[in-house]
Amino acid sequence: QSFQVNPPESEVAVAMGTSLQITCSMSCDEGVARVHWRGLDTSLGSVQTLPGSSILSVRGMLSDTGTPVCVGSCGSRSFQHSVKILVYAFPDQLVVSPEFLVPGQDQVVSCTAHNIWPADPNSLSFALLLGEQRLEGAQALEPEQEEEIQEAEGTPLFRMTQRWRLPSLGTPAPPALHCQVTMQLPKLVLTHRKEIPVLQSQTSPKPPNTTSAEPYILTSSSTAEAVSTGLNITTLPSAPPYPKLSPRTLSSEGPCRPKIHQDLEAGWELLCEASCGPGVTVRWTLAPGDLATYHKREAGAQAWLSVLPPGPMVEGWFQCRQDPGGEVTNLYVPGQVTPNSSS
């Protein structure tokens, strides 16, 4: 006689919401074997018993977690096989904060995995990556675990958050870090990853009167996704003494995008220029506060933007759009940046 369980593992991980069948069968030389599942919770799956076999159907609910035992007997001989069933939830729902990292600032980055089960620090681990390696020098703060607010009762899913204090990101700063969350289950390792773009600062010297960091530029072909998706990051080359600075994209491919220049000597006037062939127009589409309160001059492939009355540029995101195509370039200007006083 032979006693078989399929799948044969003694531990089985089942994704929440998915079903699994465990078939236990036994052949018997002296007639029909008796096969049944025991140690079942009333809620643990459903059992279909046939001559010489028994099928346990697990529905992928958290209540299905348990250790049923299949018992098979043939005459005076009996066999048994236990299966530890672990139902897990690990959707690709990572949220990182902040949305962008600013080099040169002592900052905390957090990564939250939502709707997790089991909420066990031994099975869930977080890592902050630079490329494929753990970021050296990051300091892990205490992890947090909170129960998610659920619409349905009896589904205690959790969100787990890990925070890190970042080391200096170096010069030049890397284009991005990644939060990686790994769930380690019996014979199963699952990983999700979320990018945290690093804003690249201009590399020219600071003007004498700046009291905070320089502006940062990033480009994206989609306005709506600029905050949540991977971005082509641009940097500003150095060319003292503070002339108009033109962004240069780090990626060699992709659509042709507008360029934003800053004229530090003209009271922080911004110029957006189309960088492609003829027939392209540009316009300012976003500025902190109300765009209507700014002074705008638009002339085909060039568009100027300045503050009224003349003064320091307001803190926040500025965006210029190029048509046709809809490509945009975003510029972030930190607060308290004062124009260069030319001597």
Partner: antibody, heavy 119, light 107 residues
Framework: EVQLLESGGGLVQPGGSLRLSCAAS????????MHWVRQAPGKGLEWVSY????????NYADSVKGRFTISRDNSKNTLYLQMNSLRAEDTAVYYC????????????WGKGTTVTVSS | DIQMTQSPSSLSASVGDRVTITCRAS??????LAWYQQKPGKAPKLLIY???SLQSGVPSRFSGSGSGTDFTLTISSLQPEDFATYYC?????????FGQGTKVEIK
């Protein structure tokens, strides 16, 4: 010169409260995460609590969670530790300390203030 | 929590001796380790940070090495003012933890 000067220690009965202060000078206080570290008589160093530069992040050792509260007043360059429900095992020298951005080692320590919990 | 184990807990040495103190972490802490010196009645003083970097103003006879879980503090030639208690500390993750200390006494 960078300096940290603790005050507020003393003798208190079990169950009592005490508030420690730490006056900082010689550096931009609001840019630094600050810590309290304690040392029981004849024992080693034990980290107690931290607070971030803006005060937005705090954390505590399990042994003091729910009883101690760390806070700071950046306008006064002062760090505080409010200690409630004190126990005999809280008896120690309490040091105020600063850690360095990007490195996170504790590079500056105060001279310490002694807290004695006894009836 | 990450446990830090120092050895020896105490040692006797003479002026001019080479002294080595070891510190072991219960899990990898990369290079997030500092060494402190403390004299009786005084606050600790930072000697080494990032496992092997000498803090400004600290004599070059002090050196640190190691990465991952095993670390060493070496005093190349012990001076009279070096008799003190030395602590290692990991700051890779919270709660930050200290070794139990190594007391260096005069032989």
């Amino acid at each position: 010169e960078v300096q940290l000067l603790e005050s507020g220690g003393g003798l208190v009965q079990p169950g009592g409260s005490l508030r420690l202060s730490c006056a900082a000078s010689g550096f931009t206080f609001s840019s630094y995460w600050m810590h309290w570290v304690r040392q029981a008589p004849g024992k080693g160093l034990e980290w107690v609590s931290y607070i971030s530069g803006s005060g937005g992040y705090t954390n505590y050792a399990d042994s003091v969670k729910g009883r101690f509260t760390i806070s700071r007043d950046n306008s006064k360059n002062t760090l505080y530790l409010q200690m409630n429900s004190l126990r005999a095992e809280d008896t120690a020298v309490y040091y105020c300390a600063r850690d360095r951005p990007y490195y996170y080692d504790i590079d500056v320590w105060g001279k310490g203030t002694t807290v004695t919990v006894s009836s | 929590d990450i446990q830090m184990t120092q050895s020896p807990s105490s040692l006797s040495a003479s002026v001019g001796d080479r002294v080595t103190i070891t510190c072991r972490a219960s899990q990898s802490i990369s290079s997030s380790l500092a060494w402190y010196q403390q004299k009786p009645g005084k606050a600790p003083k930072l000697l080494i940070y990032a496992a092997s970097s000498l803090q400004s103003g600290v004599p070059s006879r002090f050196s640190g090495s190691g990465s991952g879980t095993d670390f060493t503090l070496t005093i190349s030639s012990l001076q009279p003012e070096d008799f003190a208690t030395y602590y290692c500390q990991q700051y890779k993750s919270y709660p930050v933890t200290f070794g139990q200390g190594t007391k260096v006494e005069i032989k």
